[in-house]
């Protein structure tokens, strides 16, 4: 009973460097505590962008200095990543872990390719 995680293939960040996507998981168990991690894969390097553990029915709480925010609804997590620049373009992978009660389950999505385009500077107006 492996856990399946679905996320959109492509998302375009806004001109303000904000990207949002939904991470949905098919829970094989009756988890009450879930951990969601966003991983960024670029040039075969993988880094952790942010992570949050939440109780089912409660809000996600990321660290204060995190670039991520999110909300949960059932087996769906709505993730928002802010402060993105063109150099942050890459594959953002949603990782879901059902932490409690045991057994533990791991689910990893195929990733969302987030494209970030830096806005053109406004020309000086006379």
């Amino acid at each position: 009973k492996a856990m399946h995680v679905a996320q959109p293939a492509v998302v375009l960040a806004s001109s303000r460097g904000i990207a949002s996507f939904v991470c949905e998981y098919a829970s094989p168990g009756k988890a009450t505590e879930v951990r969601v991690t966003v991983l960024r894969q670029a040039d075969s390097q993988v880094t952790e962008v942010c992570a949050a553990t939440y109780m089912m029915g409660n809000e996600l709480t990321f660290l204060d200095d995190s670039i991520c925010t999110g909300t949960s609804s059932g087996n769906q997590v709505n993730l928002t990543i802010q402060g993105l620049r063109a150099m942050d373009t890459g594959l953002y992978i949603c990782k879901v872990e059902l932490m409690y009660p045991p057994p533990y389950y791991l689910g990893i999505g195929n990733g969302t390719q987030i494209y970030v385009i830096d806005p053109e500077p406004c020309p000086d107006s006379d």
Partner: antibody
């Protein structure tokens, strides 16, 4: 260099206790879940216990539940395994292993031998 | 618990030959399967994760395939240093389990 070094193994009598340690270096220890895995002489690998990065979540194999306790000290970059009520079948090399970002055990220590015999 | 069964138990081959190792799960593990190499007196080393992704520094003669319940590790041309014991592991759910191992020995 990313490294895990186990210590604390030795010879102990049945019913005795032992505390294993694993010292981590070369990576941000507090960001990773950690495991203990054992290997009896001439046998395969057996997962023993797992602990999350902040110690909030702990899991044990049925074979050691109630006898072994996993813990960690992130300030000291160290992982521990307290083993009580030891049995002959606990004789094995004990490895600590890091859980990689995608889930597999990507870094292993060299192991420490535990022998339970009268 | 998910039981992993590896076959064959022992594979006798010569350097330069192709090795094909099998791992079968008692229930689906999706692609949450890794392969490890262990040499005598050494710790296991991660070769493959996600069923088919090579770990850092692993040569491309090692490849993995499969999903669900049936998985294969292939070593295209055996080098002298490849003779070892290979274990599969599922990490999609607890308890984390390993196969019993396949020994690749020199013929």
């Amino acid at each position: 260099e990313v490294q895990l070094v186990e210590s604390g193994g030795g010879l102990v009598k049945p019913g005795g206790s032992l505390r294993l340690s694993c010292a981590a270096s070369g990576f941000t220890f507090s960001s990773y879940s950690m495991n203990w895995v054992r290997q009896a002489p001439g046998k395969g690998l057996e997962w023993v216990s797992s602990i999350s990065s902040s110690s909030s979540y702990i899991y044990y194999a049925d074979s050691v539940k109630g006898r072994f306790t996993i813990s960690r000290d992130n300030a000291k970059n160290s992982l521990y395994l307290q083993m009580n009520s030891l049995r002959a079948e606990d004789t094995a090399v004990y490895y600590c292993a890091r859980v990689g970002l995608f889930g597999p055990f990507d870094i292993w220590g060299q192991g420490t031998m535990v022998t339970v015999s009268s | 618990e998910i039981v992993l069964t590896q076959s064959p138990g022992t594979l006798s081959l010569s350097p330069g030959e192709r090795a094909t190792l099998s791992c079968r799960a008692s229930q689906s593990v999706s692609r949450y399967l890794g392969w490890y190499q262990q040499k005598p007196g050494q710790a296991p080393r991660l070769l493959i994760y996600g069923a088919s992704t090579r770990a850092t520094g692993i040569p491309d003669r090692f490849s993995g395939s499969g999903s669900g319940t049936d998985f294969t590790l292939t070593i295209t041309r055996l080098e002298p240093e490849d003779f070892a014991v290979y274990y599969c592991q599922q990490y999609g759910s607890s308890p984390w389990t390993f196969g019993q191992g396949t020994k690749v020995e020199i013929k």
